[in-house]
Interface confidence: low
């Protein structure tokens, strides 16, 4: 049978290297030789390229080499397939070399901010060493912030006579490091170069872009004044590298703006001692380039009743995240403040906080929380300048088995009964929420028994024991990850009771 007709012919001119054409050979049952027939030099010349490989994959491509390649030029390419039964020709295909040229990637050699121009970086590069002199180049520049994975792209062209191989990338975030890559193509070509090596550059610093402000209200002291811990951080979306020289804070009673107090600090928190009435607190951050917008927070009066709207709240772990969800009875509340800190016996020093808008859930990556630590999580509803009553729960980002079992005691030993008591495992050793306790007990040389009770129970009475018999008992505390036994205790039931 005649060979299959070659289809899907595609050609690429690797500029000043070779012109390679490939095709789909079809299902060949016998040895087939392919010849690529070409006319070039605007139809004035013609030549052939013959495949000489024995493997069918390699037989489906053929290359022409310098010096018999010119650009600009128009080619016709036709592929002939020949076997013992005859010859079959492909369709004639037509190619403009400028449309199929592919160059090496450009080389970025500098990414820099431009003095005095905000939110911009200038990219300078060297054109690919081998690129057609007669053609303009088009470029795609892709960029992302260093801590992002998604690229943005911008396309532009450069005139071949343009000595200025630079591009000003605008509309960026201030004082942010960007990763830049560049690719190019002959303007008329459908083939892009590979991407250049990535290069980093940073935009100019600006005045701080804003603050988020929060507070921790403490009980009033004997003199009626109330300690308020002010906390603040860069606004969400602020440049990671944004620098601040300091903060100006001013506050005044809601009823009298004339009593404004001001202070400066370089810390990221401040303890104020306020009177019992409501106060307004405002602050800005500043650096050598200016001030941020003002952040403002209202501190309620001591006797002020805060509204309640969170009805239920739960936490669960899903796909490497701790997810906290709640339900609210107030439809007009759509901003919430989340506080979280490790539940340790000392006063929390590492309070974290974050606002959530337009959602009644909050997620945090598991790896942002310490595994096996219990966290207190509180959600505050926020409506305009009012902060509602928080709803609090405890949760673990990741549970483990307790690092020690319960400390156990035996009490009220009788003839056939005994009371087993145990202490709660210290918080630091629990590694998870204790869901139950299991009491294991066994007579010497006898069969073992067990009884599981819920985590609120810290003692259990064993009954129907054998008189005058040695027993071994231990209590296991379990989390969702598994259980850990406490030390085993031996006891012996009495021979007779005082009532006998």
């Amino acid at each position: 049978a005649l060979p299959a007709k070659p289809e899907n012919i595609s050609c690429v001119y690797y500029y000043r290297k070779n012109l390679t054409c490939t095709w789909s050979p079809g299902k060949e049952t016998s040895y087939t030789q392919y010849t690529v027939k070409r006319t070039y030099a605007f139809g004035e010349k013609h030549d052939n390229c013959t495949t000489n490989s024995s493997t069918s994959e390699n037989r489906a491509s053929c290359s022409f080499f310098l010096p018999r390649i010119t650009i600009p030029d128009n080619y016709t390419i036709e592929v002939e397939a020949e076997n013992g039964d005859g010859v079959i020709k492909s369709h004639m295909t037509y190619w403009r070399l400028e449309n199929i040229a592919k160059t090496e990637p450009p080389k970025i050699f500098r990414v820099k901010p431009v003095l005095g121009i905000k939110r911009m970086i200038q990219i300078e590069w060297i054109k690919p060493e081998l690129a057609p002199v007669s053609s303009d180049l088009k470029y795609t520049l892709r960029f992302r912030t260093v801590n992002s994975t998604s690229w943005m792209e911008v396309n532009f062209a450069k005139n071949r006579k343009d000595k200025n191989q630079t591009y000003n990338l605008t509309g960026l975030q201030p004082f942010t490091e960007y990763v830049i890559a560049l690719r190019c193509a002959v303007k008329e070509s459908k083939f892009w170069s590979d991407w250049s090596q990535e290069k980093m550059g940073m935009t100019e610093e600006e005045a701080p872009c804003g603050l988020e402000l929060w507070r921790v209200l403490k009980p009033a002291e004997a003199d009626g004044r109330r300690p308020v811990r002010l906390l603040w951080k860069k606004a969400r979306g602020a440049p990671v590298l944004e620098k601040t020289l300091g903060y100006n804070i001013w506050y005044y009673p809601e009823s009298n703006t004339n009593l404004t107090e001001t202070m400066n600090t370089t810390n990221q928190q401040l303890e104020l001692h306020l009177g019992g009435e409501s106060f307004w607190v405002s602050m800005i951050s500043y650096n050598s380039l200016g001030k941020s917008p003002v952040a403002t927070l209202r501190i309620p009066a001591i006797q002020e009743k805060s509204f309640q709207c969170i009805e239920v709240m739960q936490a669960c772990v899903a796909e490497d995240q701790l997810v906290v969800k709640w339900q609210s009875s107030a439809l007009d509340v759509n901003t919430w403040m989340i506080e979280w800190f490790p539940d340790v016996d000392s006063e929390p020093t590492t309070l974290s906080w974050e606002s959530v808008s337009q959602a009644t859930n909050w997620t945090i990556q598991q790896d942002k929380l310490k595994p096996f630590w219990c966290y207190n999580i509180s959600v505050y509803p926020m409506l305009h300048d009012k902060v509602g009553e928080p709803y609090s729960i405890q949760a673990y980002a990741k549970e483990g088995v307790p690092s020690e079992g319960p400390e156990t005691k035996v009490e009220n030993i009788g003839v056939k009964t005994v009371t087993i008591t145990w202490k709660e495992i210290p918080k630091s050793e629990r590694k998870g929420i204790i869901c139950n306790y299991t009491i294991f007990y066994q007579a010497e040389g006898g069969k073992g028994f067990s009884k599981t009770v819920n985590s609120s129970i810290l003692q259990y009475g064993l009954e129907s024991l054998k008189r005058k018999t040695s027993y071994i008992v231990q209590v296991m505390a379990s989390t969702s990850a598994g259980g850990t036994n406490g030390t085993s205790i031996n006891f012996k039931t009495l021979s007779f009771s005082v009532f006998e």
């Epitope: 080389k107 050699f109 500098r110 820099k112 901010p113 003095l115 300078e124 060297i126 054109k127 060493e129 000595k163 191989q165 940073m202």
Partner: antibody, heavy 121, light 107 residues
Framework: QVQLVQSGAEVKKPGASVKVSCKAS????????INWVRQAPGQGLEWMGL????????DYNQKFKGRVTITADESTSTAYMELSSLRSEDTAVYYC??????????????WGQGTLVTVSS | DIQMTQSPSSLSASVGDRVTITCQTS??????VAWYQQKPGKAPKLLIY???TLAKGVPSRFSGSGSGTDFTLTISSLQPEDFATYYC?????????FGGGTKVEIK
């Protein structure tokens, strides 16, 4: 290894021109800018200009107001610096130096050995 | 043009001394400062670029710091081979300019 070898010392009369060459080897000539820097006897360093051999693009210190011309010959991987209308204060050691593309933009990581140009009547 | 003001113009020190040379620029040039060492009759040698990055083969006793307009070259423990003239140069953009140089001499 990277090397920049400059032409030998020259003695010129005021008003004449001098052309100093700088032959590069050990790297892709078209990939790095060549700077020219001079140093008058007992004085500091003064940047004269640069050339990008890839596209022939040049950048000059305006102080030399058209007296300096920097060129490059890709075929011989050689850069040239020509200074015209010489005066006695042009007496200096002239250096070519490769732009530190691998190290940092507009820095000079490899230097020629220097060419002493003496302008004297 | 960006002016580079280097100080001191000369200093005397002994082997083992800690030596500090400063360079002030007329405008903010971020970290784009290089430092060179030059010995009599020789071409300059690049020591530091981007204000603090050591060039290949430069001993770790040399260090650079600063950003914006104030830059410092420090030699933590001066060695006999370090007596030379040191120049700062901005590599922000053209035209490139150098500081006037600091000659480090033996006390």
């Amino acid at each position: 290894q990277v090397q920049l070898v400059q032409s030998g010392a020259e003695v010129k009369k005021p008003g004449a021109s001098v052309k100093v060459s700088c032959k590069a080897s050990g790297y892709t000539f078209t990939g790095y800018v060549i700077n020219w820097v001079r140093q008058a006897p007992g004085q500091g360093l003064e940047w004269m200009g640069l050339i990008n051999p890839y596209n022939g693009g040049t950048d000059y210190n305006q102080k030399f107001k058209g007296r300096v011309t920097i060129t490059a010959d890709e075929s011989t991987s050689t850069a040239y610096m020509e200074l015209s209308s010489l005066r006695s204060e042009d007496t200096a050691v002239y250096y070519c130096a490769r732009d530190g593309y691998d190290d940092g933009p507009y820095t000079m990581d490899y230097w020629g050995q220097g060419t002493l140009v003496t302008v004297s009547s | 043009d960006i002016q580079m003001t280097q100080s001191p113009s000369s200093l005397s020190a002994s082997v083992g001394d800690r030596v500090t040379i400063t360079c002030q620029t007329s405008e903010n040039i971020y970290r784009f400062v290089a430092w060179y060492q030059q010995k009599p009759g020789k071409a300059p040698k690049l020591l530091i670029y981007n204000a603090k990055t050591l060039a290949k083969g430069v001993p770790s006793r040399f260090s650079g710091s600063g950003s914006g307009t104030d830059f410092t070259l420090t030699i933590s423990s001066l060695q006999p081979e370090d007596f030379a003239t040191y120049y700062c140069q901005h590599h922000y953009d053209s035209p490139l300019t150098f500081g006037g140089g600091t000659k480090v001499e033996i006390k």
